[in-house]
Interface confidence: medium
């Protein structure tokens, strides 16, 4: 059973994202992983995509993230580009139209992405063995 090319793309994007440590990756997002025991894999991917979409829609033009220098501006634009790519690929894996995100718990975007990377690597190790 071959690993989906989308899964490889997601891991590659997550590797790039988790290398970036900026003020914007310290912003909080809904922690869908805090209580995900009764959630299917597809629902988890769908909900992760929803959280990411909410994040970049809200913070794409956030002045705290954009900063004042050309370097800060470029880094933030790159972050948003990676998040959009990740969102698109997660929707592809999920195959669901929509999913509820109602958790009250918060986590930093950085921790959220690290957790997602762990899940994706586990999935990759299963499908590649």
């Amino acid at each position: 059973h071959k690993c989906d090319i989308t899964l490889q793309e997601i891991i590659k994007t997550l590797n790039s994202l988790t290398e970036q440590k900026t003020l914007c990756t310290e912003l909080t997002v809904t922690d869908i992983f805090a209580a995900s025991k009764n959630t299917t894999e597809k629902e988890t991917f769908c909900r992760a995509a929803t959280v990411l979409r909410q994040f970049y829609s809200h913070h794409e033009k956030d002045t705290r993230c954009l900063g004042a220098t050309a370097q800060q501006f470029h880094r933030h634009k790159q972050l948003i580009r990676f998040l959009k790519r990740l969102d698109r690929n997660l929707w592809g894996l999920a195959g669901l139209n929509s999913c509820p995100v109602k958790e009250a718990n918060q986590s930093t975007l950085e921790n959220f992405l690290e957790r997602l990377k762990t899940i994706m690597r586990e999935k990759y190790s299963k499908c590649s063995s």
């Epitope: 440590k21 003020l23 310290e26 912003l27 909080t28 997002v29 918060q106 930093t108």
Partner: nanobody, 116 residues
Framework: EVQLLESGGGLVQPGGSLRLSCAAS????????MAWARQAPGKGLEWVSY????????YYADSVKGRFTISRDNSKNTLYLQMNSLRAEDTAVYYC?????????WGQGTLVTVSS
Amino acid sequence: EVQLLESGGGLVQPGGSLRLSCAASGFTFEEYGMAWARQAPGKGLEWVSYIVADGARTYYADSVKGRFTISRDNSKNTLYLQMNSLRAEDTAVYYCAKSLGRFDYWGQGTLVTVSS
């Protein structure tokens, strides 16, 4: 119940210094990034500085970079903001906040007035 109590504000001359403190309780302080924000009279809320949970990384608004230093003492559950080379435009109520993004918990604020 989460509580954040700021102190250290006051009247200072331009070019002077102040050190703000924020005593935190009701949550596991060392697990959360902490921020300072401020609100000048008649203006909106402005983010000032942020420090990650273990204190390893700090971030500053461009308006205070090089003049303000954020720090924390996790053993004392306390957040600090050292403010040097103060300017009239730094006059504001300063708030500490738990985490960034959704500032879900705020202190009551401490007033800093920079005037000669």
